[in-house]
Interface confidence: low
């Protein structure tokens, strides 16, 4: 998790003089808590916004927006803490918003907005605003809370960021698998443009089962420059096993951005249909 | 233009189920979460359920849980609600909205709003 661009990030508005801080994601209000304490924020609303860095490069980041409750509360609201928790790392980072002048009501609803978390492809996170300072210990809590989840690579708009093209997004292999006589299957799939070696994993898995019957993987060397976007051909030989029929092939390559651990591409083979024997028809009616 | 348009509403029984569609035009559909909310005569906005936009991801509020499903075809454009074991308390407007790129959208940043379709539950 980290913020983009850590340059002047502004939260001032007409009305309002604001900074916005580093925070340790532990107020100074938990430790020495106050009589007097804001209402939660109203309304908040997490989407998928995409930004440029300073160097051009596209991320996406989480934008973030609430409002304010019109309650008198707001004489003693003194920032915003804003936390963003990657759930399946349960890494936080944290910012503050720190009024650096004392809110008035007017005639709009106060609404503020912060779009420079940096969030990664495929990831789930909780959002967090907190109102400053933060409650006393029994008092109401203070904060809203929702959950973001980021679009995969495969997503169109994300596909052209730069964390999922650095991971190989644009290239498209077009998998292309059929089964040949004598138990072999021939893979066919375009190579990238570039000089970097292929791996196919080849799984195989018994009719309707999730455990596998064969496994097998294949190197294919690095193209050269002419046999760029080519179609690369490899034969593969299964194992004759009866029912061993089901195969998955997975190509995972080796671009010099993401090394091993690119985007994989994957197709598979059903098993061939089984001819349908007749049924004797019941000279009944089954209750199930 | 941007536009959704639901259809599928009528009356049905109690226990019965029914099959709510949207069909989107004017935008890139596959590139949005998109959900179904509610809104009960004389009562205000629920959102019932949402999907995000490669169907792989879907969520639910705990009164239809288990009872509704969204899904989606982003070839047609369409978005579905099947509604099963309907209740007399799942009468309402139902509206189909565009969320944002990622799920996890408020109501109130549903950008897209269809002119919503009724479905009564009477017996």
């Known amino acids: 998790l980290r913020l983009l661009d850590h340059r002047a990030l502004v939260c001032s508005q007409p009305g309002l003089n604001c900074t916005v801080k580093n925070s340790t994601c532990l107020d100074d209000s938990w430790i020495h808590p106050r009589n007097l304490t804001p209402s939660s924020p109203k309304d908040l609303q997490i989407q998928l916004h995409f930004a440029h860095t300073q160097q051009g490069d596209l991320f996406p980041v989480a934008h973030i927006e609430w409002t304010l409750q019109t309650d008198a509360s707001i004489l003693y609201l003194e920032g915003a803490e804003l936390s963003v928790l990657q759930l399946n790392t349960n890494e936080r980072l944290c910012v503050r918003f720190e009024f650096l002048s004392k809110l008035r009501h007017h005639h709009r609803r106060w609404r503020f907005t912060f779009s420079h978390f940096v969030v990664d492809p495929d990831q789930e996170y909780e959002v967090t605003v907190h109102h400053l300072p933060k409650p006393i210990p029994d008092g109401d809590p203070n904060h809203q809370s929702k959950n973001f989840l980021v679009p995969d690579c495969e997503h169109a708009r994300m596909k052209v960021t730069t964390p999922c093209m650095s991971s190989g997004s644009l290239w498209d292999p077009n998998i292309t698998v059929e089964t040949l006589e004598a138990h072999q299957l021939r893979v066919s799939f375009t190579l990238w443009n570039e000089s970097t070696h292929y791996q196919i994993l080849l799984t195989s898995f018994p009719h309707m089962e999730n455990h596998s019957c064969f496994e097998h993987m294949h190197h294919i060397p690095a193209p050269r420059p002419e046999e760029f976007h080519q179609r690369s051909n490899v034969t593969l030989t299964l194992r004759n096993l009866k029912g061993c029929c089901r195969h998955q092939v997975q190509i995972q390559p080796f671009f010099s951005s993401c090394l091993n651990d690119c985007l994989r591409h994957s197709a598979t083979v059903s098993c061939p249909e089984m001819p349908d024997t007749p049924e004797p028809i019941p000279d009944y009616m089954p209750l199930w | 233009q941007v536009q959704l348009v639901e259809s599928g509403g009528g009356l049905v029984q109690p226990g019965r189920s029914l099959t709510l569609s949207c069909t989107a035009s004017g935008f890139t559909f596959h590139d949005y979460a998109m959900h179904w909310v509610r809104q009960p005569p004389g009562g205000g906005l629920e959102w019932v359920a949402g999907?995000?936009?490669?169907?792989?991801?879907?969520g639910y509020a705990d009164s239809v849980k288990g009872r509704f499903t969204i899904s989606r075809d982003n070839a047609k454009k369409s978005l579905y609600l099947q509604m099963n074991s309907l209740r007399s308390e799942d009468t309402a407007l139902y509206y189909c909205?565009?969320?944002?790129?990622?799920?996890?959208?408020?109501?109130?940043?549903?950008?897209?709003w269809g002119q919503g379709t009724m479905v009564t539950v009477s017996s």
């Open positions: 909205a565009k969320g944002g790129m990622g799920s996890g959208s408020h109501p109130d940043s549903f950008s897209t």
């Open positions: 999907v995000s936009w490669n169907g792989n991801n879907v």
